[in-house]
Amino acid sequence: EICGPGIDIRNDYQQLKRLENCTVIEGYLHILLISKAEDYRSYRFPKLTVITEYLLLFRVAGLESLGDLFPNLTVIRGWKLFYNYALVIFEMTNLKDIGLYNLRNITRGAIRIEKNADLCYLSTVDWSLILDAVSNNYIVGNKPPKECGDLCPGTMEEKPMCEKTTINNEYNYRCWTTNRCQKMCPSTCGKRACTENNECCHPECLGSCSAPDNDTACVACRHYYYAGVCVPACPPNTYRFEGWRCVDRDFCANILSAESSDSEGFVIHDGECMQECPSGFIRNGSQSMYCIPCEGPCPKVCEEEKKTKTIDSVTSAQMLQGCTIFKGNLLINIRRGNNIASELENFMGLIEVVTGYVKIRHSHALVSLSFLKNLRLILGEEQLEGNYSFYVLDNQNLQQLWDWDHRNLTIKAGKMYFAFNPKLCVSEIYRMEEVTGTKGRQSKGDINTRNNGERASCESDVLHFTSTTTSKNRIIITWHRYRPPDYRDLISFTVYYKEAPFKNVTEYDGQDACGSNSWNMVDVDLPPNKDVEPGILLHGLKPWTQYAVYVKAVTLTMVENDHIRGAKSEILYIRTNASVPSIPLDVLSASNSSSQLIVKWNPPSLPNGNLSYYIVRWQRQPQDGYLYRHNYCSKDKIPIRKYADGTIDIEEVTENPKTEVCGGEKGPCCACPKTEAEKQAEKEEAEYRKVFENFLHNSIFVPRPE
């Protein structure tokens, strides 16, 4: 029986009975939050062989091993993952071993085994036999291996039954529990699976098979399952489904969506039966089972029951995420907020059309309206009293509407109104009239020339850069000295700079009136000598990184009610010089014959320029006499050699470990202080753990579908 679309067993261990007839779980399996420490030995699900998505175990009291529950679980496909993981075992208080002795393949995703205080037999499993890449596995905070004393079958009797492999330079027996070896296929099978008797399976089999070289005898399929056979691709008129089997059109048409009862049903696209059209595609009609490409972003129509949607916080903006057409009116009233500009862009940046009016009032947190970065049409089907479809009133810090050089916005019907926006220059409003096609609609009082822009330097002169010099982490720039009509009006200059991979930034990007600003700012005093050009050295920059820089003259903005001139430069794009790259990451070497080494690595995290080649150096090492000094046949005589495992459980380090005796009177020495890089790595590690935990808790405590 195929069970699905995902099984969530929580709070009551008896819910496990839902797995009774499952051979394949099409979806995920969650077993979590079970408080009663029951005897799970009476629960056994030998039929279950495949989970197509992921397996998550979290806080299940009393469960000591998974081997009795799932003795034949062979493949976890990882078609969908839980935060990049196909197997998650987290905070399992009583789990002593994993015990999934028939688990042969995790097709996609990594494993995360964390905070299981009693869990052993982790170092005895060779995950590289199960997963393609082990570098993303996260195994931390479990029972320390030295407290485990893991012994594979037969080791005590000096008749070891399990095979050996090398992990982290350690050649050892591989097993799941004290009486279950980890299965390995003969090298002659290559990447193929094998039977219990070590005969090679058919190439289309995955994990195991009941008979050799037979595509109908597979426990699981490498690619797709269809009509009892494992096939490399789905036959004509059948479609891939859930990443593992082939179904026909009728099957696809009749699937009920697990997500919601009123969904439009599944679609067929690119040979696959799927719940929704993929990103960039839309259904070819509401009842269609087929997808067509969208022109630009795919439309998503959002409607407000009460006709007018008030945006007064990030939370209210969140409701508009992904909307491209808003049926109704927008009332924006953002008085305060943290990082508000970029948050609003995140949630409202895709809106292209508003069918009613747009009203922005008392939004003192806004500096610009550029967060509505795709707005191109205000229909004005509904208007405010006075026939206004764009209304901007009392926004104390609003300086820019949009970047009109890169913006097409049409207001189809209705007038504009602007009043009491002291930092918004009237020239900016007149520019909007021209672009939006509303010129001539407004009457005299609709754009107040006295109280708009009264506290701004509106008539801007252009500051010109005179020189730029770069090094790997510095930029030196100078500019013409600005001379306003009265030199006393010039106070200083402010230099704004930020990383800009692309030449598309604007002055108001990410800026709001509450202190959030994506630009770094540096004040530059006037040089005392009037003939010296002002300039600045920007340091602490990244090598081979493009920066955007502009300069503003800081002037007195009001002289007896006359507007005075301000000045600023164009945005200059400048790249720092290249530098030495950081070290290549994850260097691994392995021997595949008596005369060859295969060396693999990942690119450096900071290339600091265009990488053109790598240099690989090697040298022969003398044979280590240490290897010959011990009888390796006797387990207790093996000297303990410590290998760094690269993880530190910060919470478990309680004191400075004593690392060596320094001789003489000195006594024991403390460990060397951590380098900045180590501290940073620890900080990132702790942050990563927290992010995962947040994701886990958030995923588990959610409103369930009705």
């Epitope: 709070n11 009551d12 939050l33 079970i34 408080s35 806080r59 009291a61 905070e91 927290k690 992010v691 935990e693 947040n694 994701f695 886990l696 808790h697 958030n698 588990i700 405590f701 959610v702 409103p703 369930r704 009705e706």
Partner: antibody, heavy 115, light 107 residues
Framework: EVQLVESGGGLVQPGGSLRLSCAAS????????MSWVRQAPGKGLEWVSR????????YYADSVKGRFTISADTSKNTAYLQMNSLRAEDTAVYYC?????????????WGQGTL | DIQMTQSPSSLSASVGDRVTITCRAS??????LAWYQQKPGKAPKLLIY???SRASGVPSRFSGSGSGTDFTLTISSLQPEDFATYYC?????????FGQGTKVEIK
Amino acid sequence: EVQLVESGGGLVQPGGSLRLSCAASGFTFSSYAMSWVRQAPGKGLEWVSRISPSGGSTYYADSVKGRFTISADTSKNTAYLQMNSLRAEDTAVYYCARESYYEWGAMDVWGQGTL
Amino acid sequence: DIQMTQSPSSLSASVGDRVTITCRASQSISSYLAWYQQKPGKAPKLLIYGASSRASGVPSRFSGSGSGTDFTLTISSLQPEDFATYYCQQYYSSPLTFGQGTKVEIK
């Protein structure tokens, strides 16, 4: 002994702010979700807000969304409820409660409440 | 949001009586239901979770049953210390919601 102690209640004008604290002791604070529940004089219990064990996920009743903020400081073993733009209908005894380790949403330890 | 409705809103009983309080959810909540006891001026106390599991330290005279939408709290033999207000609460989905309470008074 497992204990929760609330503080920070008091009299405030409509529109004002208060910050409630809930000091936890006797258990591993970072392993438990915490909730705030309130009870208006002579009325029943009303759930207000919840923070997940890791502190990364927060949940609110519609009546307080946008005005109240729940947070936790695991180094101090303390949960907080920042209440802004207070209204007359927010008058209540506010209880801090620990959610069960396994039965998320069921509250097995309660504080004495703060008015 | 899921509405929880308790009945009766109050009842009078004598020591030794068997008392039953019911709670109905506006939609199925499986067995994600808790019962609490609250005495005047005191904080609530968890009695039952998972619809039928007794919290630690709760006397065996308290029992819970039901699943889906209909639930019952039974006190098999009312004791003097049991006179209080009882609340049911669902934790099937957020927001968590309580019933309006049932006051058990001395007859």
